[in-house]
Amino acid sequence: EEELQVIQPEKSVSVAAGDSATLNCTVSSLIPVGPIQWFRGAGPGRELIYNLKEGHFPRVTPVSDPTKRNNMDFSIRISNITPADAGTYYCVKFRKGSPDVELKSGAGTELSVRAKPSAPVVSGPAVRATAEHTVSFTCESHGFSPRDITLKWFKNGNELSDVQTNVDPAGKSVSYSIRSTARVVLTRRDVHSQVICEVAHVTLQGDPLRGTANLSEAIRVPPFLEVTQQSMRADNQVNVTCQVTKFYPQRLQLTWLENGNVSRTEMASALPENKDGTYNWTSWLLVNVSAHRDDVKLTCQVEHDGQPAVNKSFSVKVSAHPKEQGSNTAAENTGTNERNIY
């Protein structure tokens, strides 16, 4: 009598995640009587994948009708494959008994699963930073297999080199994740800049996946302040302007102080954008000189994006004759520096 053979013709099968995998198995003889079961892995820790007689295996179906007479084909199809399904599958013949006794195993078929990386997600710094400072961006992508993957960073189309990338886990796994950090030095012109994380993998049809982040979310451009006095009007009123230029984001509060007392507070809103993405704002204050005996100390105080206030102060000379007032006189800065200090 010829010895029963359990034939698994394929040593290995590779499928794409989401597809179905067919694992072939035939037996050379109908005797002895007894069931066939499919396992993943070998030894005592093996996992039962399919048993015709009992159990619920919603993703596993027999390729041919196992109930038909003289059936010797015990191939199975596993639907909706995920990376977690990777492993070596064994078709095992049992001899009928109480309990059934394992008789012979096939050589095993290794199932390899190729899976696409998830769309890269780029996250930036939690708090804004100013020009000349370095900020870090992180890019993450998950669930890919095999492990080989390339990740590149670009800022405005130019590849970044200050990059640290890790693929986890280091050892063999059903799927992998990549995490990369890029360090970017900010400039005042970066409001419209963009960083791109580009991931390439064998499963992608030639086109890398991209994740983006706008530097506008990461940058703060502090304002320049300039206070000027226009020529005195006939009604003894002086028009003083505070020009706040080249700032980002728009969140800005401007306060006028006369001799240290709050005169008016304004909030910036709906400002037109400069070409470089920054904003300008001009505020006017009319000072009635005839209402003052002494010189008036005016302060333009700007609070930008929750940062410490920047002041620009100067004095309106009350003693001077109106006709002698020069036009468009720039104020002296008696307050803090015109740029924020961090």
């Epitope: 040593k11 190729r114 064998v202 499963t203 992608l204 049809q205």
Partner: antibody, heavy 116, light 109 residues
């Protein structure tokens, strides 16, 4: 699923020539496609690929001599200025469904002969 | 660019023989290697992908092995229809470029 090349002919050195690859049974917007060539009695040589979205990538030796493009149903290889060493059978092929590391569907090839 | 060195460049064998063809990459290509069979005047046919996976419809007498830089195509029992030229082809996941070996012609002894 199949691919077929066309446009191969006798061409003069210095003249342009465009080869086409027509696909059936699948969409060019879903797969990477490649161009290859084989000089008489020689081995296979990779020319370039075009990605599913239409981005071309070339072998380092191409140096701007060839241009790969595609429409919804055909992929083209434009040879800007023929040289005698371009005499070869040109094949187009489609990458496999599992990834871009192998080509599982090949056309029969089209012969380009460059001679004055 | 990666170089693929295939050996031997030709071999003579008889029907039923076990035939082994090797391919060496100038740097690691992991398992991104395919084997093709080509007959005169015909297009290449895919036999093996990912170094060891048999393409559907290809007879099981063909097998592939190896990873990194050294790869092997084995025909366990040569059949009359197997007399052809065999090419290895690599894909490098960093440069995303393809390279072929120079081919191995299997002839009848």
């Amino acid at each position: 699923q199949s691919v077929e090349e066309s446009g191969g002919r006798l061409g003069q050195p210095g003249t342009p020539l465009t080869l086409s690859c027509t696909v059936s049974g699948f969409s060019l917007s879903s797969y990477v496609m490649g161009w290859f060539r084989q000089a008489p009695g020689k081995g296979l040589e990779y020319i370039g690929i075009i990605s599913s979205s239409g981005s071309p990538y070339y072998a380092s030796w191409v140096n701007g001599r060839f241009t790969i493009s595609k429409t919804s149903t055909t992929m083209d290889l434009k040879m800007n200025s023929l040289r005698s060493e371009d005499t070869a059978t040109y094949f187009c092929a489609r990458v496999g469904p599992l990834g871009v590391d192998y080509f599982n569907i090949w056309g029969p090839g089209t012969l380009v002969t460059v001679s004055s | 660019d990666i170089q693929m060195t295939q050996s031997p460049s030709s071999l003579s064998a008889s029907v039923g023989d076990r035939v082994t063809i090797t391919c060496r990459a100038s740097q690691s290509i992991n398992s991104y290697l395919a084997w093709y069979q080509q007959k005169p005047g015909k297009a290449p046919k895919l036999l093996i992908y990912s170094a060891s996976f048999l393409y559907s419809g290809v007879p099981s007498r063909f097998s592939g092995s190896g990873s990194g830089t050294d790869f092997t195509l084995t025909i366990s029992s040569l059949q009359p229809e197997d007399f052809a030229t065999y090419y290895c082809q690599s894909w490098h996941y960093i440069s995303r470029s393809y390279t072929f070996g120079q081919g191995t012609k299997v002839e009848i002894k």
